[in-house]
């Protein structure tokens, strides 16, 4: 896919940080989402997973940023091969896993 600008990745990281650090109650009421392979194409895979969570304002901005980073249109119920379809995790764990992976990519200078 296209290489997103580092500013968009920074924005995503800061938003994920904001979510993880400011949880006062279970994120999205403890909703479960499909785990994803944190590899190339993960922005679309992350969006495909999170877009199925409705009524959770805490992740609206994350969904919007991911829309901008994913080169194709994503809609609810859509799944790619990037999902680990036998594993569901809480949104809070999903967000933190994604955050730590993005931090690693940023440190290594890989923005794909």
């Amino acid at each position: 896919g296209p290489v997103p600008p580092s500013t968009a990745l920074r924005e995503l990281i800061e938003e994920l940080v904001n979510i993880t650090q400011n949880q006062k109650a279970p994120l999205c009421n403890g909703s479960m989402v499909w785990s994803i392979n944190l590899t190339a194409g993960m922005y679309c895979a992350a969006l495909e997973s999170l877009i199925n969570v409705s009524g959770c304002s805490a992740i609206y901005r994350t969904q919007r940023i991911l829309h901008g980073l994913c080169p194709h249109k994503v809609s609810a119920g859509q799944f790619s091969s990037l999902h680990v379809r036998d594993t569901k995790i809480e949104v809070a764990q999903f967000v933190k896993d994604l955050l730590l992976h993005l931090k690693k990519l940023f440190r290594e200078g890989q923005f794909n």
Epitope: I13, Q21, Q23, K96, K103, R107
Partner: antibody, heavy 122, light 109 residues
């Protein structure tokens, strides 16, 4: 190779002032947050203050807020800690530490200086 | 303000596994870093981002973090691992860096 070298420590009387410096090399100084961490004799690590890469955001422990000021000169690759109204309980080894990332809330400290001893006593 | 609780001391025989815990309210939501400090020396980062190791740190050092407890695990402990170990997080509610009180690891024998 990343190097952090603190200086400016010494003996000062209660109520006095001291300015610590930390000369940094081996990395793009302005791209990383920096911090001061202290350790009183025989005690654990205590965070003192931190500053963003640009210097635009500063953070202080409650125990030093209003007395200590952190700053940086990115053109000189140097971090500073101005310490005023010093108290006996400020006696400690002061370490300069480099943050491992640009985002403040993800800070871990991947490089530390060897420390400079500040003794506050009459 | 946020509090991190570590056991003051942990003792282990050479070759065994040492586990040092760091307790905090919902610490699993935070990102934990671990430092090793030997007498008279500056701290050294041994685990960052819950479970990653900086280059040069042996694979024997590993970390985990979930719920209310983060754990630093040192397998096949050696005499040279004897040191103080500190956990650390960022507390967003106070904009403070927070360190645990430290754990002294003693290698027996």
């Amino acid at each position: 190779e990343v190097q952090l070298l603190e200086s400016g420590g010494g003996l000062v009387q209660p109520g006095g002032s001291l300015r610590l410096s930390c000369a940094a090399s081996g990395f793009t100084f302005s791209s990383y947050a920096m911090s001061w961490v202290r350790q009183a004799p025989g005690k654990g690590l205590e965070w003192v203050s931190a500053i963003s890469g640009s210097g635009g955001s500063t953070y202080y422990a409650d125990s030093v807020k209003g007395r200590f000021t952190i700053s940086r000169d990115n053109s000189k690759n140097t971090l500073y800690l101005q310490m005023n109204s010093l108290r006996a309980e400020d006696t400690a080894v002061y370490y300069c530490a480099k943050a491992d990332f640009w985002s403040g809330t993800l800070w871990g400290f991947d490089y530390w200086g060897q420390g400079t001893l500040v003794t506050v006593s009459s | 303000s946020y509090v991190l609780t570590q056991p003051p001391s942990v003792s282990v025989a050479p070759g065994q596994t040492a586990r040092i815990t760091c307790g905090g309210n919902n610490i699993g939501n935070k990102i934990v870093h671990w430092y090793q400090q030997k007498p008279g020396q500056a701290p050294v980062l041994v685990v960052y981002d819950d479970s990653d190791r900086p280059s040069g740190i042996p694979e024997r050092f590993s970390g985990s973090n979930s719920g209310n407890t983060a754990t630093l695990t040192i397998s096949r402990v050696e005499a040279g691992d004897e040191a103080d170990y500190y956990c650390q997080v960022w507390d967003s509610s106070s904009d403070h860096v927070v360190f645990g009180g430290g754990t002294k690891l003693t290698v027996l024998g």
